[in-house]
Amino acid sequence: PASLAGCYSAPRRAPLWTCLLLCAALRTLLASPSNEVNLLDSRTVMGDLGWIAFPKNGWEEIGEVDENYAPIHTYQVCKVMEQNQNNWLLTSWISNEGASRIFIELKFTLRDCNSLPGGLGTCKETFNMYYFESDDQNGRNIKENQYIKIDTIAADESFTELDLGDRVMKLNTEVRDVGPLSKKGFYLAFQDVGACIALVSVRVYYKKCPSVVRHLAVFPDTITGADSSQLLEVSGSCVNHSVTDEPPKMHCSAEGEWLVPIGKCMCKAGYEEKNGTCQVCRPGFFKASPHIQSCGKCPPHSYTHEEASTSCVCEKDYFRRESDPPTMACTRPPSAPRNAISNVNETSVFLEWIPPADTGGRKDVSYYIACKKCNSHAGVCEECGGHVRYLPRQSGLKNTSVMMVDLLAHTNYTFEIEAVNGVSDLSPGARQYVSVNVTTNQAAPSPVTNVKKGKIAKNSISLSWQEPDRPNGIILEYEIKYFEKDQETSYTIIKSKETTITAEGLKPASVYVFQIRARTAAGYGVFSRRFEFETTPVFAASSDQSQIP
């Protein structure tokens, strides 16, 4: 039979072309891409491949070693001068490791038939590749009809005698895929029908999407689908100390590429992303939520001595409201308002002040007015009560002024203007206020309400009364107006500094109407209601009677 080197013997050693070829070809990188998993690589098998040639004088293994003295498994056949060639080379059983689609990469050389003298009629430039699925590792079968053809393999580049002389080897690489596979493994078979071939390497592999960490989610090694257009949806799992709102998913393509990421993981509160992992926030730093990118320094007036803090602790005398975000500085109550001044107008007081020097670090400062009525003699103060009106309001004041109306006249008041903010109610400390003491102006007194008759005679009536409920100042005198009933136009007025009088020169057995009013520096109050008293008859004894209702 013709050899590939051009001689027509069947040498036991590899001819020159094989050496040249292997020296060139096998220096090519043996490493496979990370998304390819080899099921078989004839270049890396150290011992016997365990392949079978049938018939025995067809394909033959050429035993060579590379520069590291590792065996090189090369099969060649070159029966180009003989008709009806049917030489089979069967691999050992190859596990598919769960892959449903596998790839076969062949590296081979092929002699150009035109360069072979006298063999044009019988010489071929192709060979066939077949496979046979089997769960049985020992079920190698050489019945041709049980093998399924994968493809006819032709060379892109064939070599000539000239190439041999120039030591130029034209190595072909062909890749075919097979699928879907349904059994645990398979056998490959190479059929020569009269070509001059050297099969340098056979690599069988499947493609996977290699395990990857993306967006803090771990996606496992995933074998690609059987269909060349299929995208497999794969769920990822969040790395340590990370969480997700939307479960992470990616799609594994038939080519072993990860595509179309959906969702992501985020480092949980107290952890931040660094180099694809979630690292703990160190003391002095915090992260309140997974949605925040990185740990931040504690805000002013707060600290944390813990790792993995989700918030910081407020310093002594500083506070944080529940509604304050953890990124906000801790704050404290404000200092007292300053420079309070008052303006009294009769029974109204206008107060004005300037804001506290220290707002406690907050913008929500407001003011509260406490009103106390003080007894100038006893020095005792009491709450003013509900009759006082505050304009615009007593608490929650945003402006630095307020008006109090409906105060009592000629009364000592203490007003406490307190500054408060959002954390005042959290602080056990003393209230921060400025005090203003004022005395309201005197006003006309209120009416006299309580009048008692005293000694009544035929020509006189004695009366006594109590000071008005609200004198509104110092009572200077009382004015008593009286007239005979139904003769209102003819009245008499008596003035008295005391709370008793006697009206003289009255008619016996007559009804008289009395009205009393008090006067302060601010003027007279209104007259009291009418009180009617009757003088005694001429012959009656005088009487001393109690209070008239």
């Epitope: 003391p283 002095g284 600290y303 001595h305 790792e307």
Partner: antibody, heavy 120, light 111 residues
């Protein structure tokens, strides 16, 4: 007023054990990290161990790792240092010190120290 | 571990003069823009006292004649006008990385 008071020091034989205490007052103990620092006679300061307020963060010096255990009881405002397998080189005054609140934190309050002597 | 080396081991300075103590760390003690370097003063028989934290921040209650500077691996404690009560040992300490190591100390004497 912030105060830290160490106790439990004394003479112990090599290989023996001792438990130091540090009583704290004048601050919210449970929110503060506390350190143990020691000083051998005539030598410099050596940091020993740290525990955070919630005991979630604990660090040790290599020289005491595996032999000393730092712990705390926040309900008693007390810090502890359990010292086992004591060696002569552990002889020192042991101080507890509070981690400060001004960032980046220093050790702002220290106890008066308690002397541990390891000798046969 | 980060090794802290102080220089000099001791120095004598006259009253009213400036005293400078250096501290070098075997690796940077900076993190996120801050230097985790503290300085302490210790008098014989007493507990140490914090003077400077974060390389340059004066602890409350410490006289302003004390100051700190530096970043990365090189730091300095300066006492601008020496007072009699400043005679003591001074220690630098890094708190950037566990273990929180101290320098060997510098003894300052008044001339």
């Amino acid at each position: 007023e912030v105060q830290l008071v160490e106790s439990g020091g004394g003479l112990v034989q090599p290989g023996g054990s001792l438990k130091l205490s540090c009583a704290a007052s004048g601050f919210t103990f449970s929110t503060f990290g506390i350190h143990w620092v020691r000083q051998a006679p005539g030598k410099g300061l050596e940091w020993v161990a740290y525990i955070s307020g919630a005991s979630t963060t604990i660090y040790y010096a290599d020289s005491v790792k595996g032999r000393f255990t730092i712990s705390r009881d926040n309900s008693k405002n007390t810090l502890y240092l359990q010292m086992n397998s004591l060696r002569a080189e552990d002889t020192a005054v042991y101080y507890c010190a509070r981690y400060g609140t001004s960032f980046p934190y220093g050790l702002d309050y220290w106890g008066q120290g308690t002397l541990v002597t390891v000798s046969s | 571990d980060i090794v802290m080396t102080q220089s000099p081991d001791s120095l004598a300075v006259s009253l009213g003069e400036r005293a400078t103590i250096n501290c070098k760390s075997s690796q940077s003690v900076d993190y996120d823009g801050d230097s985790y370097m503290n300085w302490y003063q210790q008098k014989p028989g007493k507990a140490p006292k914090l003077l400077i934290y974060g390389a340059s921040n004066l602890e409350s209650g410490i006289p302003d004649r004390f100051s700190g500077s530096g970043s990365g691996t090189d730091f300095t404690l300066t006492i601008s006008r020496l007072e009699p009560e400043d005679a003591a040992s001074y220690y630098c300490q890094q708190s950037n990385e566990d273990p929180f190591t101290f320098g060997q100390g510098t003894k300052l004497e008044i001339k």
